[in-house]
């Protein structure tokens, strides 16, 4: 059952899913100048049986200029760099992720994918919070939120996390090193990084190209 609301917003914190529950949908979004192929599904869907979960459908993007063709356009040098970056992030994410029964891992990138990922979560999904760089976590309990359903209405539990303006960021489960983050999150409506239950994710890589950065914020 789809969650029909958004995970709570915690000031100076971001969240992510470690794995995606079966039923989770990911929008097939393409970068500017590209569009989803005509015959392509608008979503990828996390499906599975008792032993294995995986993403159904493959997102495919084609040039907006190229009508009636599914030919994959060769990326320009700057696009290749962006794609390589995304591939690297994906590998790092996979290394981080636990194999949970009934859950899918982060799907690999596709050619000319948009810079944001929009996920649609389902009941039972857990997301984990961490403070952004420059803020320290004061935990009163688990820094996580779970989508639950009561009387046919969905809601996310409130994460027990407060982020105070001090040095080190907190860590997501299973991560040993603090993650790098951009200095502050952009506040303008146009540039804001987004996550909702239609969970938009924008990923970047640090200048060192060594640390996976995961920055998300509400739309």
């Amino acid at each position: 059952e789809l969650c029909d609301d958004d995970p709570p917003k915690i000031t100076h914190a971001t969240f992510k899913a470690v794995a995606y529950k079966e039923g989770t949908m990911l929008n097939c979004e393409c970068k500017r100048g590209f569009r989803r192929i005509k015959s392509g599904s608008p979503y990828m869907l996390c499906t599975g049986n008792s032993s294995h979960s995986s993403w159904d459908n493959q997102c495919q993007c084609t040039s907006s200029a190229a009508r009636n063709t599914t030919k994959q356009v060769t990326p320009q040098p700057e696009e290749q760099k962006e794609r390589k970056t995304t591939e690297m992030q994906s590998q790092m994410q996979l290394a981080d992720q636990v194999s949970l029964p009934g859950h899918c891992r982060e799907p690999p990138p596709w050619e000319n994918e948009a810079t944001e990922r929009i996920y649609h979560f389902v009941v039972g999904q857990t997301v984990y919070y961490q403070c952004v760089q420059g803020y320290r976590a004061l935990h009163r309990g688990p820094a996580e939120s779970v989508c639950k359903m009561t009387h046919g209405k969905t809601r996310w539990t409130q994460p027990q996390l407060i982020c105070t303006g001090e040095t080190e960021p907190s860590q997501f489960p299973g991560e040993e090193e603090p993650q790098a983050s951009p200095d502050g999150l952009p506040e303008s409506e146009t540039s804001r990084l987004v996550t909702t239950t239609d969970f938009r994710i924008q990923t970047e890589v640090a200048a060192t190209m060594e640390t996976f950065i995961f920055t998300t914020e509400y739309q």
Partner: antibody, heavy 116, light 106 residues
Framework: QVQLVQSGAEVKKPGSSVKVSCKAS????????MHWVRQAPGQGLEWMGY????????EYNQKFKDKATITADESTNTAYMELSSLRSEDTAVYYC?????????WGQGTLVTVSS | DIQMTQSPSTLSASVGDRVTITCSAS?????MHWYQQKPGKAPKLLIY???NLASGVPARFSGSGSGTEFTLTISSLQPDDFATYYC?????????FGQGTKVEVK
């Protein structure tokens, strides 16, 4: 009590546009998504899409992606759905319904008739 | 898209009858929801998450099922129950409804 009050019936020419409104009261408007559902004469219900009023994020049924544009105005607690390039087959009753899970509250419906 | 097929499309019954409407989904879904609609009115939530009665709904209504097969039952049809009934899934986008079952007077 929760109420969704929709704008009145409209008669439109083919090729024109129409904007249907849905004014919410009795709850926090930004706490629930607003969905839109279409019902053609004598037909069943079709989900068109929703808007998250607190963020402006919209999700559409692909069938209506090029037909409908859903917006919301927090200041007036009103959701809107604009239908473009109207054709006779767009003649239907359009409902708004409060989300957050099952549709527990519905507007009374707005009949849009497209006729030359 | 998940297709929802209701049967029958029309059901002729009398007051006091036991009425059963089935809804079959083209793929497995987690829950089914049911709405009742009367002519000229908006749909009204009847049953949510397969078997739970919405507020104010009489106990003669019940729902059951799992996977792809779901059922709405009215144990003893009352005059107020003549209406059209729709099943609805919200397990995946696009959200979809059945084509409706009209319960009419025999």
């Amino acid at each position: 009590q929760v109420q969704l009050v929709q704008s009145g019936a409209e008669v439109k020419k083919p090729g024109s546009s129409v904007k249907v409104s849905c004014k919410a009261s009795g709850y926090t408007f930004t706490s629930y998504r607003m969905h839109w559902v279409r019902q053609a004469p004598g037909q069943g219900l079709e989900w068109m899409g929703y808007i998250n009023p607190s963020t402006g994020y919209t999700e559409y049924n692909q069938k209506f992606k090029d037909k409908a544009t859903i917006t919301a105005d927090e200041s007036t607690n009103t959701a809107y759905m604009e239908l473009s390039s109207l054709r006779s087959e767009d003649t239907a009753v359009y409902y708004c319904a409060r989300g957050g899970g099952v549709f527990d509250y519905w507007g009374q419906g707005t009949l849009v008739t497209v006729s030359s | 898209d998940i297709q929802m097929t209701q049967s029958p499309s029309t059901l002729s019954a009398s007051v006091g009858d036991r009425v059963t409407i089935t809804c079959s989904a083209s793929s497995s879904i987690s829950y089914m929801h049911w709405y009742q609609q009367k002519p000229g009115k908006a749909p009204k939530l009847l049953i949510y998450t397969t078997s739970n009665l919405a507020s104010g709904v009489p106990a003669r209504f019940s729902g059951s099922g799992s996977g792809t097969e779901f059922t709405l039952t009215i144990s003893s049809l009352q005059p107020d129950d003549f209406a059209t009934y729709y099943c609805h899934q919200r397990s995946t986008y696009p959200l979809t409804f059945g084509q409706g079952t009209k319960v009419e007077v025999k």
